[in-house]
Amino acid sequence: QEPGGLVVPPTDAPVSPTTLYVEDISEPPLHDFYCSRLLDLVFLLDGSSRLSEAEFEVLKAFVVDMMERLRISQKWVRVAVVEYHDGSHAYIGLKDRKRPSELRRIASQVKYAGSQVASTSEVLKYTLFQIFSKIDRPEASRIALLLMASQEPQRMSRNFVRYVQGLKKKKVIVIPVGIGPHANLKQIRLIEKQAPENKAFVLSSVDELEQQRDEIVSYLCDLAPEAPPPTLPP
């Protein structure tokens, strides 16, 4: 247990053995806009039945599209992908050393859970205690992009604010993206209140994700520092 009586969730086993690759032989950018900053970005995908199978597919496509616009590597933008329902399922971890194209392929393979509940409290707890348990890149910005389309039951949201505050203490920016009529606006407003950087995007449906994509990527990218120039030997 963490101080304050918060139960630490068990760590997921890695999805697959990591394959090393030479990061200098990077894959060429796929788009004109390309975020080359120091950033640890976590995608949190709502796995509830509030999204139909088709809508969840659009959500996944949005994540893959966003990943195409990031300079993904262990040196620049590191990504994690988590699907959440009543628990959390990590598909990609921040430390996974795989080619960007392989990471995008894995993101496209996230399974539709279609569960009754998607607990934002549980996934924020997972983000706090598992993904950002140790800050191994203090120079990078840390952002959780919370893609939410549903409301968790009140009994599950008791520690919600504590998790958001815990993330703030660890300098993790939480950006909620509310999708559709069932997104929990109360929780979105609570997240926004915790820090000025916690900007929310509220969309009427998944169809608006593509329209908002570039604005969301630009906002994330602007929050992250540029890499310092390489120091020359004296």
Epitope: S52, E53, A54, E55, F56, E57, K60, A61, V64, S108, Q109, V110, K111, Y112, G114
Partner: nanobody
Framework: QVQLVESGGGLVQAGGSLRLSCTAS????????LGWFRQVPGKGREFIAV????????LYSDSVKGRFTISKDNAKNTVYLQMNSLKPEDTAVYYC??????????????????WGQGTQVTVSS
């Protein structure tokens, strides 16, 4: 294995309608979604529409949204593509394709494992 057989193609005037059918047989219990793609000579397969077997939800490409409708009849293991307000640029071979799980993106032909033989649709001006 899943076998897919398309029918309903043909020659139609611009502004007209056609209804394509795709009947699945074999291991259809493993079907997650069925999609329609089209191909013109010398080009890759273009995503048109997909319908999800479990909940009947569907997606369309921007080029056909509002004109084409995908639907399914579970009892007949058949998916239909109702094509209205057809344009000459809709001329292509139309393929039905099976997806057995949620891996891959819905608009990429790589995510589909079994394909029909195709049916020709020609729209004359």
């Amino acid at each position: 294995q899943v076998q897919l057989v398309e029918s309903g193609g043909g020659l139609v005037q611009a502004g007209g309608s056609l209804r394509l059918s795709c009947t699945a047989s074999g291991r259809t219990f493993s079907t997650y979604a069925l999609g329609w793609f089209r191909q013109v000579p010398g080009k890759g397969r273009e995503f048109i529409a997909v319908i999800y077997w479990r909940d009947g939800s569907s997606l369309y490409s921007d080029s056909v949204k509002g004109r084409f409708t995908i639907s399914k009849d579970n009892a007949k293991n058949t998916v239909y593509l109702q094509m209205n307000s057809l344009k000459p640029e809709d001329t292509a071979v139309y393929y039905c394709a099976n997806r057995h799980d949620s891996r891959g993106t819905y608009y990429s032909s790589r995510g589909y494992d079994y394909w029909g033989q195709g049916t020709q649709v020609t729209v004359s001006s």
